[in-house]
């Protein structure tokens, strides 16, 4: 029996969430990230789409670009040149992959209020950015890099070998974009704009994934993407630097790769400028447990870049892969040689270290059974970082300041007691020299963004408090949320439970497990969300649980690296263990338990359904990985090694969904995938379906034609409606 949800007259005036609320984004929130342009000024797009410059110290604001100008070219984005003379306006946005897109760019001259005519930019452009000083422009067009000294000048072509799907200059190929750089660009200006560094990716030998894009034409198009799957040939990367003052003088100079890296397959992982004549490159062996940070200096006499071995710092993991999801990047100190970096300490927790001469001599700055997560800013006297130290909740984020200008360095939590109940998960954005900063709180209460003084930490003003959202939620019966932990066999399993509004422990509820579970992920976070699962709890009376098991992040290397070379084992075990513990709590109807997940979560939900435990009645996998041989090399090999006999082929074969086809016989399985998924290819679900058919196992399926990994637009509505029907049917809930 489904519990009644109305108990008194006051609650009669309140309503449950509807699926429509979720699909319409009725209860979405806003954040405010200042677009800093100096120590005390930022730009912001006002509600009426004017671009406004705010000066914190004078309290004055003025419009630098009117909505009329924006509208005249249908601009959806803008960028002010550092000398404040020009603005680029971006329009005709056309999405490519996760970060990449092409667009048309117009340059507007603020001094005369006119668009720059003559030597206009070609279209569509793949990436464009101003130099950090002045108004030089670098842009990528048709996989080649161009430079303009001034917006109206003719362009100087830096590279000539760019070719679609073959050679990428200044932009990443598919795998570098998605799995290594997490950006749409692969070029970096030096701090004063003297030099421009860029990556060249050669994809000539990479196998191509091809899939049909049906469109509206008589014949479908074929999309071809060089995409290295596990064990396949990888992109060949080279890094070049060109002097932008005299670009034709010596041309681009290649930066040497450290010998210990170049001896076998390798990746470039990031570039950080230190000064105009010092640059830091990070490299990674293909077997991703060794990372090398190389500091290179410009040799004026030879006009080349020198990377002495004494300036190579090696980071190696003996228990897993190097870093967390990515290898951390350095934050350099004012001496322009020493830096701060997050990596594992001797106890296996990621902490901030200060490195000067060697990694062996690193000074540990933070320590404890918690993790430092991000270094935001280092000034002459302070280091700002985030961690999950406070009150020992790994799913929280607070901002801390360490005074490094005196000894011993003292630590202060900037955010811990600001709005303690409302705000437990923060990020921050700092102005130049950290004169001011914005705090963005994501929950667990309604998100709020505030502006603070960088010296005193005093709150100056509220930038966004989501008042409309707060009012809209006043008559909504939101589910209750609790974050707790289970201690099982020396493993701590943190979970978030979302409970119906009138939850009664003495009654029995259907349980839905929402899982992601990928390496270095975290699902149990103290953040605000009104989403599909909120609706399922509020209106449909389900209990929803999210569990962070082995392989998840920010709780130390023991938990994180437990899944190394063994994906698909412990993540699944820990979800099952948690379900058993939830049943013991007494309020779960053990005949009505489901699991669902997307992407890596679809893989885990499929394996959990096929675990043969009899715990799950039904489940959903959206865009799942089904075999690690089908997924990208950079991601897969980081955690699994290579699919070769002498490495880890055996576990690649043992960890497929297809190998467990027989076990789906006693569950209701809904398999969903977009046919134009560039990331987790439709191939994954096609192979699951084939294995299930071959085993004569019934299942349900839904494909989304021409949709990618995000299943966006109208597909989203269809998807959630379809999944809702499936779950309600599974749980015998009336429509």
């Amino acid at each position: 029996l489904r519990p009644s949800r109305v108990h008194n007259s006051e609650e009669n005036t309140m309503r449950a969430l509807t699926l429509k609320d979720i699909l319409n984004g009725t209860f979405s929130y806003k954040t405010f990230f200042p677009n800093w342009i100096s120590g005390q000024e930022y730009l912001h797009q006002s509600a009426d789409n004017n671009i406004v410059l705010y000066n914190i110290e004078t309290g004055q604001s003025y419009t630098i670009l009117s909505n009329r100008t924006m509208k005249s070219v249908n601009a959806s984005n803008y960028g002010l040149s550092p000398d404040r003379q020009f603005v680029y306006l971006e329009s005709d946005y056309s999405k490519l992959w996760r970060y990449s897109y092409t667009a048309t760019y117009y340059i507007y001259d603020l001094s005369n209020g006119e668009f720059v005519r003559g030597n206009e930019l070609p279209r569509p452009i793949q990436y464009l950015c101003w130099s950090p000083v002045g108004s030089k422009l670098a842009y990528v067009y048709q996989n080649n890099i161009y430079l303009k000294q001034r917006p109206g000048d003719p362009p100087f072509q830096i590279t000539f070998n760019g070719r679609e799907n073959k050679i990428f200059n200044g932009i990443p190929d598919w795998v570098y974009e998605e799995e290594m750089l997490a950006t749409k660009y692969a070029l970096w200006w030096s701090p004063n704009g003297k030099f421009l560094a860029y990556a060249e990716f050669n994809d000539t030998d990479i196998p191509v994934i091809a899939y049909s894009y049906y469109g509206d034409e008589q014949y479908p198009r074929t999309i071809n993407i060089p995409y290295p799957k596990a064990g396949a040939k990888n992109p060949v990367v080279r890094i070049f630097i060109i002097d932008t003052t005299y670009p034709a003088y010596v041309g681009p100079q290649e930066v040497p790769v450290p010998a210990m890296i170049a001896s076998s397959d390798y990746y470039f992982s990031w570039l950080t400028w230190v000064t105009d004549e010092r640059v830091c490159l990070q490299w990674l062996k293909r077997v991703q447990n060794v990372s090398v940070l190389s500091i290179c200096d410009f040799r004026e006499d030879w006009q080349t870049w020198d990377c002495p071995k004494t300036q190579e710092h090696i980071e190696e993991s003996r228990t897993g892969w190097a870093g967390g999801f990515f290898v951390s990047t350095p934050v350099f100190s004012y001496d322009a040689i020493s830096y701060y970096k997050i990596f594992s300490d001797k106890d296996g927790y990621k902490h901030i270290h200060y490195i000067k001469d060697t990694v062996e001599n690193a000074i540990q700055i933070t320590s404890g059974k918690w993790e430092a997560i991000n270094i935001f800013r280092v000034t002459q006297d302070s280091l700002f970082y985030s961690s999950n130290e406070f009150e020992e909740y790994p799913g929280r984020r607070n901002i801390y300041r360490i005074s490094i200008g005196s000894y011993p360095p003292s630590k202060k939590c900037v955010t811990c007691h600001l709005r303690k109940e409302r705000c437990q998960y923060y990020t921050a954005s700092f102005s130049d020299y950290a004169k001011y900063y914005a705090l963005v709180c994501y929950g667990p209460g309604i998100p709020i963004s505030t502006l603070h003084d960088g010296r005193t930490d005093q709150e100056i003003k509220i930038l966004e408090e989501n008042k409309e959202l707060e009012n809209a939620l006043k008559n909504i019966q939101l589910p209750k949320e609790e974050i707790k932990k289970l201690e099982v066999d020396e493993i701590t399993l943190w979970y978030k439970m979302i409970l119906p509004p009138q939850f009664d422990r003495s009654k029995k509820y259907p349980l839905l497990i929402q899982v992601y579970g990928g390496p270095c992920s975290q699902s149990v976070r103290s953040v605000f969300a009104v989403n599909w699962i909120s609706y399922l709890a509020s209106k449909e009376g389900m209990v929803i649980a999210l569990v962070d098991g082995r392989g998840t992040a920010f709780q130390g290397d023991k938990l994180l690296y437990a899944v190394y070379r063994k994906l698909g084992v412990y993540e699944v075990e820990d979800q099952i263990t948690a379900v058993r513990k939830f049943i013991e709590m007494g309020f779960i109807d053990e005949k009505r338990i489901a699991i669902w997940g997307w992407s890596y979560g679809g893989y885990v939900s499929s394996l959990a359904l096929a675990s043969g435990t009899g715990l799950f009645k039904c489940g959903i996998a959206v865009a799942p990985v089904s075999s690690w041989e089908y997924y990208a090399s950079v991601y897969t090999e980081r955690f699994m090694g290579l699919p070769t006999k002498d490495d880890n082929l055996e576990h690649y074969k043992n960890s497929t969904v297809m190998a467990r086809a027989e076990y789906f016989r006693n569950v209701d399985y809904l398999l969903i995938h977009g046919t134009a998924d560039d990331n987790v290819h439709f191939q994954n679900s096609a192979q699951i379906a084939k294995a299930l058919v071959n085993a004569q196992v019934d299942f349900q399926a839904m494909w989304y034609s021409d949709q990618n990994h995000g299943l966006s637009g109208l597909s989203t509505n269809h998807l959630y409606t379809h999944m809702t029907h499936f779950l309600k049917q599974c749980f015998s809930l009336s429509d």
Epitope: D335, Y354, K356, I363, I404
Partner: antibody, heavy 122, light 106 residues
């Protein structure tokens, strides 16, 4: 006023041991990195080693690592140098030095004691 | 890292300008200090971070350099400036000193 006062020097036979002390006053000893430096008669300065405020890091010049031990007692505001297996070339004036923390993460030797003489002879 | 100081000794008159140099066997990235030691006394810090004057040090002293090459310049020598000068790096342990420069009155 900052003061560093070394003591414990004297005549010691080759192969013998000696413990030097350095009493600090006039500053917050427990927050300072401290060092020992020596100067042989008529010669230059030689860095022996350093110790950080909480004694968790001690560094030595490699040639002296196995015969000298630097330690400190913050409760007594005292720095120590335990010398073992001494040889004639260890004859020198031994200074203790301490100094300000300098950003980022190192210190300078702003304060020096007047030194204590160690003579190694049979 | 070895520190090579030159000259080992030099004679100069009051009012003159002198320069003492220090070469490191590897890049020490400005982690260099200069000390003055008068006869029978303890050394005194003059300069740190290659070019920052310690508290109370007269402005006639100045440090410069980068990479492996550093120098200490004394403008308009005063009688109290005579004695020995040492450089010391703080890049990586051991923090070695240069051999010293003895500055004598001409």
């Amino acid at each position: 006023e900052v003061q560093l006062l070394e003591s414990g020097g004297g005549l010691v036979q080759p192969g013998g041991s000696l413990k030097l002390s350095c009493a600090a006053s006039g500053f917050d000893f427990s927050t300072y990195w401290m060092s020992w430096v020596r100067q042989a008669p008529g010669k230059g300065l030689e860095w022996i080693g350093e110790i950080n405020p909480d004694s968790s890091t001690v560094n030595y010049t490699p040639s002296l690592k196995d015969k000298f031990i630097i330690s400190r007692d913050n409760a007594k505001n005292t720095l120590y140098l335990q010398m073992t297996k001494v040889r004639s070339e260890d004859t020198a004036l031994y200074y203790c030095a301490g100094g300000y923390y300098r950003y980022p993460y190192y210190y300078t030797m702003d304060y020096w004691g007047q030194g204590t003489t160690v003579t190694v002879s049979s | 890292l070895q520190m090579t100081q030159s000259p080992a000794s030099l004679s100069a008159s009051v009012g003159e300008t002198v320069t003492i140099t220090c070469r490191a066997s590897g890049n020490i990235h400005n982690y260099l200090a200069w000390y003055q030691q008068k006869q029978g006394k303890s050394p005194q810090l003059l300069v740190y971070n290659a070019k920052t004057l310690a508290d109370g040090v007269p402005s006639r002293f100045s440090g410069s350099g980068s990479g492996t090459q550093y120098s200490l310049k004394i403008n308009s020598l005063q009688p109290e400036d005579f004695g020995s000068y040492y450089c010391q790096h703080f890049w990586s342990t051991p923090y070695t000193f240069g051999g010293g420069t003895k500055l004598e009155i001409k």
